[in-house]
C-alpha cells in the first residue's frame, strides 16, 4: 500500500475546520475490514484518530477529528480537524495499513488575520517640528508572529528608535505593540505595517502631521 | 509631461568619487520617493536605494550601504547620489525612477534615461 | 534578499504571434510584481504591476497573471515595437529585486 499526502502545509485558520489530507490506492476487493488507519502526532506520537478492526474507533484528541467513512472504501484516509486551535500545529503522521503498511507525514500551520493597527501619538498636542515623538501601533490577535515595518509617507522605511514587542495571549494569538520615536519634520507620514508571513495578510495605519491639526487619514 | 533628466556621462579614476544627478519635472517633486537602480552586465539590475524627496530620509539595500549617498535639493528638484571609493566593479549604468503606488506596495512608473559610469584608470 | 528568477533569457517570435515571459520568486510575494520594458535610445517604461495591473497608457496586448511565487508576461499578437528586453521586479518588501532580463529579438 502507498500512502500520498499534500506536500505543502496545511494552513488553517484559528476556529475554522482543516482537512488533513491523505490517501491510498485500495486493490480491488478491498473491505474497510482489512484496514488499519492511525493518525497521530508525528513528534509524540499522541493518537489523535484511528479506525481499526472495520470500525471508527473515534477521535483520541479533544474529540474534534473526524473521518470521512463513506470515502474510506475509496482510499480517503482524510482527516477533518474541527475548531483550529494554536496548539493544533505541527505534524501529523497517516499510517495505513492493509496487508503492508506505509506511513506520511503532513504539516499544519495555523494562523490568524491581525487586525488593522491602532494608531496614538505622545504627545498628541502642541506638536511643532523638532519635537520628539512617541507613534505607537498596535494590533491584536493574529498568529504567527508578525513582521513589522515603518515607512513614511513616500514608502521610505523609517528604521531609526524602533522597540516592537509580540505578547501571546491565553489563546496562543499574538498582540503586537511597536514604537517609533521620531522627530517631527514640517509635516509628514508616519505609516506601521503589521504583515502576517503565513497569510501574506497586510494590515496598516497611518498618521499624518501636516503643521495643525493631527490627522488620522482613512484607508486607501 | 513627467520627466527625469540624468546628468552625463562619467569618466573617473579608481579610488575617487562621483556624484550625478536625476531632475524631476512635469510634476510635485517632492511628493515621490525617488529610487537609484544600477545596470551592470554581471548583476542586471540591482535597487540600490530610495530616497523621500520631502524629509530626505533615506534607505538603502545592504550592498550599498557605505558606496551610495543619496541626497536631494528641493529648491532645484534635483536627486544626487554620490559614489564613494570607486572600482572597476562600480562601472554601470546608473538610473534614477519615481516611486509610484500605495502603501506599502511602491513601483517605478517614470525612469531616467541613466548615466553612464565608467571606472578606469 | 528575495531571487527572482526569469525564464527564457532569449526568446524569437514574429510580429502577430503571442508570447510569455516568465518569472519565478524565491519565496512568496503575494501578487506584487512588477513587468519593465527596456529599449534602446527610451527611457524604461512599467507596463505592469501588482501582477496584473496595465500601467495608464499601456496597450490591452500586455497582460500578466500569476501570484505567490510564479508569474506569466503575455504579449498576445506582438507587434514590431514590442522587440525589447523585459524585466520582472517585485515589489513586495525591500530590497526591491529584478529578475535578469528576457531578450525578445525578431524571428
Known amino acids: 500500500v502507498e500512502v500520498q499526502v499534500s506536500e505543502d502545509p496545511v494552513v488553517a485558520l484559528v476556529d475554522t475546520d482543516a482537512t488533513l489530507r491523505c490517501s491510498f490506492s485500495p486493490e480491488p476487493g478491498f473491505s474497510l475490514a482489512q484496514l488499519n488507519l492511525i493518525w497521530q502526532l508525528t513528534d509524540t506520537k499522541q493518537l489523535v484518530h484511528s479506525f481499526t478492526e472495520g470500525r471508527d474507533q473515534g477521535s483520541a484528541y479533544s474529540n474534534r477529528t473526524a473521518l470521512f467513512p463513506d470515502l474510506l472504501v475509496q482510499g480517503n484516509a482524510s482527516l477533518r480537524l474541527q475548531r483550529v486551535r494554536v496548539t493544533d500545529e505541527g505534524s501529523y503522521t497517516c499510517f495505513v495499513s492493509i496487508q503492508d503498511f506505509d506511513s506520511a507525514a503532513v504539516s499544519l500551520q495555523v494562523a490568524a488575520p491581525y487586525s488593522k493597527p491602532s494608531m496614538t501619538l505622545e504627545p498628541n498636542k502642541d506638536l511643532r517640528p523638532g519635537n520628539m515623538v512617541t507613534i505607537t501601533c498596535s494590533s491584536y490577535q493574529g498568529y504567527p508572529e508578525a513582521e513589522v515595518f515603518w515607512k513614511d509617507g513616500q514608502g521610505v522605511p523609517l528604521t531609526g528608535n524602533v522597540t516592537t514587542s509580540q505578547m501571546a495571549n491565553e489563546r496562543g494569538l499574538f498582540d503586537v505593540h511597536s514604537v517609533l520615536r521620531v522627530v517631527l519634520g514640517a509635516n509628514g507620514t508616519y505609516s506601521c505595517l503589521v504583515r502576517n508571513p503565513v497569510l501574506q495578510q497586510d494590515a496598516h495605519g497611518s498618521v499624518t502631521i501636516t503643521g495643525q491639526p493631527l490627522t488620522f487619514p482613512p484607508e486607501a | 509631461e513627467v520627466q527625469l533628466q540624468q546628468s552625463g556621462p562619467e569618466l573617473v579614476r579608481p579610488g575617487v568619487s562621483v556624484k550625478i544627478s536625476c531632475k524631476g519635472s512635469g510634476y510635485t517633486f517632492t511628493d515621490y520617493a525617488m529610487h537609484w537602480v544600477k545596470q551592470s552586465h554581471a548583476k542586471s539590475l540591482e535597487w540600490i536605494g530610495v530616497?523621500?524627496?520631502?524629509?530626505?530620509?533615506?534607505y538603502y539595500s545592504q550592498k550599498f550601504k557605505g558606496k551610495a549617498t543619496m541626497t536631494v535639493d528641493k529648491s532645484s528638484s534635483t536627486a544626487y547620489m554620490e559614489l564613494a571609493r570607486l572600482t572597476s566593479e562600480d562601472s554601470a549604468i546608473y538610473y534614477c525612477a519615481r516611486g509610484a503606488g500605495y502603501f506599502p506596495y511602491w513601483y517605478f512608473d517614470v525612469w531616467g534615461a541613466g548615466t553612464t559610469v565608467t571606472v578606469s584608470s | 534578499d528575495i531571487q527572482m528568477i526569469q525564464s527564457p533569457s532569449y526568446l524569437a517570435a514574429s510580429p502577430g504571434e503571442t508570447i510569455t515571459i516568465n518569472c519565478r520568486a524565491s519565496?512568496?510575494?503575494?501578487?506584487?510584481l512588477a513587468w519593465y520594458q527596456e529599449k534602446p535610445g527610451k527611457t524604461n517604461k512599467l507596463l505592469i504591476y501588482s501582477g496584473s495591473t496595465l500601467q495608464s497608457g499601456i496597450p490591452s496586448r500586455f497582460s500578466g497573471s500569476g501570484s505567490g511565487t510564479d508569474f506569466t508576461l503575455t504579449i498576445s499578437s506582438l507587434e514590431p515595437e514590442d522587440f525589447a528586453m523585459y524585466y520582472c521586479q517585485q515589489h513586495y518588501e525591500y530590497p526591491y529585486t529584478f529578475g535578469g532580463g528576457t531578450k525578445l529579438e525578431i524571428k
Open positions: 530616497i523621500n524627496t520631502y524629509s530626505g530620509n533615506t
Open positions: 519565496k512568496s510575494i503575494s501578487k506584487y
